[in-house]
Interface confidence: low
């Protein structure tokens, strides 16, 4: 495939990445799948600057990101190292709370209304943000 040099229609370019902001809600796994079908991934936040950019666009609404601990340790969907990377959890979070009565704990991370992160039940239908890197090879065949 060829290298993507500009963002698709309705995506927002920022710092060599393209972002798409949903206006509806899906469970985390469905949001993750949506982004993959767009040759993208749920947003991976690697800096305070990127955090502020995403926060500006989503407003004060619960929104999924590409961070989960469904298999034990916290992991970013694109393989970015969690332990050494940027974090912006709310105080006392993540807490893997079991008191919600929905079964299990809380394995998926989302932006809360003030931008900081919380872990929540992955089935909740929150908005989501997809991200893809401009320098990444696109799956589309090159134009001949």
């Amino acid at each position: 495939g060829s290298e993507r040099t500009c963002c698709p229609v309705n995506w927002v370019e920022h710092e060599r990445s393209c972002y798409w902001f949903s206006r509806s809600g899906k469970a985390w796994a469905d949001a993750d799948n949506y982004c993959r079908l767009e040759d993208a991934h749920l947003v991976v936040v690697t800096s305070w600057e990127e955090q502020k950019f995403v926060q500006h666009h989503i407003g004060p609404v619960n929104t999924w990101m590409g961070l989960h601990d469904q298999n034990g340790p916290w992991k970013w969907v694109d393989g970015t190292d969690y332990e050494t990377g940027f974090k912006n959890w709310r105080p006392e979070q993540p807490d893997d709370w079991y008191g919600h009565g929905l079964g299990g704990g809380e394995d998926c991370a989302h932006f809360t209304d003030d931008g900081r992160w919380n872990d929540d039940v992955c089935q909740r239908p929150y908005r989501w943000v997809c991200e893809t890197e401009l320098d990444k090879a696109s799956q589309e065949p090159p134009l001949l």
Partner: antibody
Framework: EVQLVESGGGLVKPGGSLRLSCAAS????????MNWVRQVPGKGLEWVSS????????YYADSVKGRFTISRDDAQNSLYLQMNSLRGEDTAVYYC????????WGQGALVTVSS | DIQMTQSPSSLSASVGDRVTITCRAS??????LAWFQQKPGKAPKSLIN???SLQSGVPSRFSGSGSGTDFTLAISSLQPEDFATYYC?????????FGPGTKVDIK
């Protein structure tokens, strides 16, 4: 247009109870953290309690912990504050406010605790 | 708990003056700071959140700056409707706390 309207204020005797309501409109209520803030007439602002969307997280000021209960009914777009064991120092105007940065406020409900 | 202080506690100014109010947090709060305006008998009104983001509909003569522990609210050219009490508030951690307020009155 975002609107928050409090009701349920009034005069109550020390030790009594009162339930405040806040009716919300103009936004997707269930997605937002909601708060109660109070203000003694002529004094400053004091945060009372917060409840996150889906009621997952609830917080109280130490001054009301164990006496006040915050709750919400997302189907009714309503926020509540159940106030028990009321004291003279709880006399204040009570405001509901949206999100943790309090971007929108109701007009307030006066609660007077006096014998 | 995070303590918030404001200075001055009151100030007298004239229409057209530039006014600045400072707010200090007892520990770092990044940019999780809001400013409110309150007039007698009315509910507070949000002016600024995230230290510098102007709330929709707020006139551009209001501006906010700062990060960490020190913050400033500025009014570039005071208008008659700006005479009020101004509060800062941290929403970095619970319990959320407000500054004691700064009353701006007519000189």
């Amino acid at each position: 247009e975002v609107q928050l309207v409090e009701s349920g204020g009034g005069l109550v005797k020390p030790g009594g109870s009162l339930r405040l309501s806040c009716a919300a409109s103009g936004f997707t209520f269930s997605s937002y953290t909601m708060n109660w803030v109070r203000q003694v007439p002529g004094k400053g602002l004091e945060w009372v309690s917060s409840i996150s969307g889906s009621s997952t997280y609830i917080y109280y000021a130490d001054s009301v912990k164990g006496r006040f209960t915050i709750s919400r009914d997302d189907a009714q777009n309503s926020l509540y504050l159940q106030m028990n064991s009321l004291r003279g120092e709880d006399t204040a105007v009570y405001y509901c406010a949206r999100v943790t940065s309090f971007d929108y406020w109701g007009q307030g409900a006066l609660v007077t605790v006096s014998s | 708990d995070i303590q918030m202080t404001q200075s001055p506690s009151s100030l007298s100014a004239s229409v057209g003056d530039r006014v600045t109010i400072t707010c200090r947090a007892s520990q770092g709060i990044n940019n999780y700071l809001a400013w409110f305006q309150q007039k007698p008998g009315k509910a507070p009104k949000s002016l600024i959140n995230a230290a510098s983001s102007l709330q929709s509909g707020v006139p551009s003569r209001f501006s906010g700056s700062g990060s960490g522990t020190d913050f400033t609210l500025a009014i570039s050219s005071l208008q008659p409707e700006d005479f009020a009490t101004y509060y800062c508030q941290q929403y970095y951690s619970y319990p959320f706390t407000f500054g004691p307020g700064t009353k701006v009155d007519i000189k």
